[in-house]
């Protein structure tokens, strides 16, 4: 049981107060981490308080200002990055997002030599993606969908694609798609180590439907935004990986990375591309059917100036269960002699482990093992491999960074983490400098957050980088709601569950419930993680429990409850729900007259089908921004869990399981449906059908659509989103204002 | 893996043209710079023309610029030469390569003769 102190005492109840929604809202009770920008073995950036780029030396103790923020202002500078050889800073201004990982900006480069910005061959503006090499100061950018090269930033540019359209070819950037459900960043380019080559993407969307939708915004007509997004089953982008050689880009252009001939001979996407010498890449492609992986080690042949990725260095990863991977499959941590590499697959149990590639998958070493997973490799260095795990006390909800000293034999293992700060820790990420050299740690709950910097060899902190002391003394005369994690046993099942309990949490009472769900496909909602948000508030003020419950599909406890929704989304996420439902009525303070459920986005997917489940346990619930039908959700993410809507393959499956389908069952529940006008991510079409089914069945409900807004509701629509919600569950479970 | 092969070569007057083609096959090259080299008997292969594979960079000796003329036709394959003004010092066996930056590697043609003579 993870049990957050509520700091009640009855000498001090007086000067206690519950959390208001207002505190949520204005975001009183946030908290900071502390994230190194590492530029070195022992140094990294940091901006502090008043908005100074600071540079700290580890070792000898000293910092300095490497960049004002008179300097910072001159521009409206929200962003920054110096080049490796430490001549130039470029300052990014005018920020303007497009979707969840790309923005435009301008930039300005800054020469510390001379103190003053770089006039002559500026750059154009707005930039989509700019870096600078990764030695030296050479610049790739990306502008109107084309990459350009600078050797030097006063140089002039060198055109390196020429193809490049809006929405048709994008050249070092993502399209959408592969933006949100393939790459899960802004760029698609990567320097290599000592930036002698650059490799990049091209995407070929000219054949992808486009999903239209009207922006009011303030004008007489409303502007159509348009995006190539295939759903599931429609026309994909066609993606093409080339290299360019930077020191000679006008010798020899850039040159395309083959495709391995067994993912080649049918639709594929690629999912990442990994350096590993300046004459080495690796690059990993998936089959549209997503349970077929390859990974390509491919060499540069100095005769052609070319890319050679033989037969005998193509690694197979398939998965006969599910999909490949888990979200994403993993990517390489290659070791020092530049073929042998460290990545996480399921082994023969199920489990997602690190294994050690040599030369064949078949013959990989199992690094890690046991009925928990290993979730990420931070670093590899030549004598110790980082890596993070929830193997610690058999919680699945936990992280905890773990050393394996692979220099040894036999290789031990050691936690990092485990025993810090273990009831304030519980859950750890990490970031480390050159050559692990030091690292922080930044610790996310369950009690308050802490960063703290350690040594690399001796694991010793160094000191407390951010330990949100200014949160813990606004806390303290905050009555907060107990939280607890615990599992329930059903049917060989192991439901994980959060319980959110009020401050004077009374068994012997009776409390209404509110189900708080996602439920997606390899995702955890039930974290050892610190959060004061809109839930606290509910069962802080309004008295509710709350409960989070991670069912069938969701992450990291082996593949049987990973894959068992494969195929078949909708239905056993939401069998889960109702199952945990059941059992926390059967715990005896749960008023089963007054039981909700909400979500957003599949969260919201599911709590509409357990309203809709007919089993009368729901009074009301939310959905924000759902998913309704997979026929109307993206390609690479539906396609992966539940294959193609064709007849040949689950086009049953994918009309039996939308909300339409159950509109009739609604007719017992108060419903409140939301969605932005403006959602690129899960289109405000999945509410519309929604709301037109529910119509058609005459069946009264509740709705709230935010103009112009995305997939987020930010801004003001966030605070009238929670406020409006609020009024809905106090009404429905008949608590007074 | 990659065969070049000249044409167009022949013998001419001084201040007349001659147009050189240069035809690939095997490997695409379109992505790689293409470059006209001459030989003059008892001297040392000098370029005399080259286009980038960019297709609008090109560069020209002082000794041909405004003369000769380099073009490029990808999706045929094919390299030119556009000699005009032709002077006896022009006099060479005149070959097309691949050229790579800072390196010699022999994707050559075997060549073809250009004599200016009255």
């Known amino acids: 049981i993870v049990l957050r102190p509520s700091r009640v005492h009855n000498s001090e109840e007086n000067t206690m107060r519950a959390l208001t929604l207002k505190d949520i809202l204005n975001g009183t009770f946030s908290y900071k981490t502390f994230f190194p920008n590492w530029i070195s073995g022992q140094e990294y950036l940091h901006q502090s308080a008043d908005n100074n780029i600071v540079l700290y030396n580890i070792e000898t103790g000293q910092s300095y200002t490497i960049l004002s923020n008179r300097t910072m202002k001159s521009v409206n500078a929200s962003n920054y990055g110096l080049s490796p050889d430490r001549q130039f800073v470029y300052l990014e201004s005018d920020y303007s997002k497009l979707w969840r990982y790309s923005y435009t900006a301008t930039y300005y480069i800054y020469d510390l030599s001379n103190g003053e910005f770089v006039r002559g061959n500026e750059l154009p503006r707005p930039i989509q993606y700019l870096c600078w090499s990764p030695v030296g100061s050479k610049l790739a950018y990306v502008y109107q969908n084309n990459i350009y090269l600078k050797q030097r930033p006063g140089d002039p540019p060198f055109q390196i694609t020429f193809n490049g359209r809006e929405n048709k070819i994008f050249n070092g950037i993502p399209d959408w798609v592969y933006e949100e459900e393939m790459l899960a960043t802004k760029y698609a380019l990567w320097w290599s180590p000592n930036g002698k080559f650059l490799a990049y993407a091209e995407f070929n969307d000219t054949d992808i439907p486009v999903i239209a939708y009207s922006y009011y915004g303030d004008e007489q007509y409303p502007r159509t935004i348009n995006i190539p997004y295939p759903k599931a089953g429609a026309k994909n982008p066609v993606v093409r990986i080339f290299i360019i050689d930077t020191t000679y880009p006008a010798y020899v252009g850039p040159q395309e990375v083959p495709v391995p001939a067994m993912i080649a001979s049918s639709d594929y996407y690629f999912s990442w591309l990994t350096w590993v010498t300046d004459e080495r890449v690796c690059l990993q492609w998936l089959k549209r059917v997503q349970n077929v992986s390859v990974l390509s080690i491919c060499d540069f042949r100095e005769d052609w100036q070319t890319w050679d990725c033989p037969k005998t260095q193509e690694h197979i990863e398939e998965s006969r269960t599910g999909w490949a991977g888990g979200f994403f499959v993993s990517t390489p941590v290659f070791s020092y002699d530049a073929i042998s590499y460290y990545k996480i697959f399921s082994d023969k149990d199920g489990y997602k482990h690190i294994h050690y590639i040599k030369d064949t998958v078949e013959n990989a070493i199992q690094i890690t093992s046991g009925k928990w997973e290993a979730i990420n490799i931070f670093r590899v260095t030549q004598d110790s491999l980082f890596y993070s795990s929830n193997e610690f006390e058999e919680y699945p909800g936990r992280r905890n960074i773990y050393r394996i000293s692979i220099g040894s034999y036999p290789p031990s293992k050691k936690c990092v983490t485990c025993h810090l700060r273990k009831e304030r820790c519980q859950y750890y990420t990490a970031s480390f400098s050159d050559y692990a050299k030091y690292y922080a740690l930044v610790c996310y709950g369950p009690g308050i957050p802490i960063s703290t910097l350690h040594d690399g060899r001796t694991d010793q902190e160094i000191k407390i980088l951010e330990e949100n002391k200014e949160l813990e003394n606004a806390l303290k005369n905050i009555q907060l709601p107990k939280e607890e994690i615990k599992k329930l046993e059903v049917d060989e099942i192991t439901l994980w569950y959060k319980m959110i309990l009020p401050p004077q949490f009374d068994r012997s009472k009776k409390y209404p419930l509110l189900i708080q769900v996602y439920g997606g496909p390899c995702s955890q909602s039930v974290r050892s993680v610190f959060a004061v948000n809109w839930i606290s508030y509910l069962a802080s003020k309004e008295g509710m429990v709350i409960a989070l419950v991670d069912g069938r599909g969701t992450a990291f406890q082996g593949d049987k409850l990973l894959y068992a929704v494969y195929r078949k989304l909708g239905v056993y996420e939401v069998e889960d729900q109702i199952t945990a439902v059941r059992k926390f009525i059967e715990m005896g303070f749960i008023d089963e007259k007054r039981i909700a459920i909400w979500g957003w986005s599949y969260g919201g997917y599911v709590s509409s089908l357990a309203l809709a489940s007919g089993t009368g346990l729901f009074k009301c619930g939310i959905a924000v921004a759902p998913v309704s039908s997979w026929e109307y959700y993206a390609s690479v993410y539906t396609e992966r869990f539940m294959g193609l809507p064709t007849k040949d393959d689950n086009l049953e499956h994918y009309k039996n399981s939308t909300v339409m389908a159950r509109a009739e069952y609604f007719r017992n529940v108060d419903y409140l449906l939301i969605h932005g006008t403006a959602d690129d991510n899960v289109h405000f079409q999945n509410s519309a059908q929604i709301a037109k089914a529910l119509v058609n069945a005459q069946v009264d409900f509740q709705a709230m659509w935010y103009s112009d807004q995305n997939h987020g509701l930010s801004g003001l629509s966030t605070n009238h989103l929670y406020t409006h919600m609020t009024h809905f569950l106090k009404q429905c479970f008949s608590l007074s204002d | 893996e990659v065969q070049l092969v000249e044409s167009g070569g022949g013998l001419v007057q001084p201040g007349g043209s001659l147009r050189l083609s240069c035809a690939a096959s095997?490997?695409?090259?379109?992505?790689?710079?293409m470059g006209w080299f001459r030989q003059a008997p008892g001297k040392g292969r000098e370029l005399v023309a080259s286009?980038?594979?960019?297709?609008?960079?090109?560069y020209y000796p002082d000794s041909v610029e405004g003369r000769f003329t380099i073009s490029r036709d990808n999706a045929k394959r094919m390299v030119y030469l556009q000699m005009n003004s032709l002077r006896a010092e022009d006099t060479a066996v005149y070959y097309c390569?691949?050229?790579?930056?800072?390196?010699?590697?022999?994707?050559w043609g075997q060549g073809t003769q250009v004599t200016v003579s009255s």
């Open positions: 095997g490997r695409t090259l379109s992505s790689y710079t």
């Open positions: 286009i980038s594979w960019v297709d609008s960079i090109t």
């Open positions: 390569a691949v050229i790579f930056p800072e390196q010699v590697y022999d994707y």
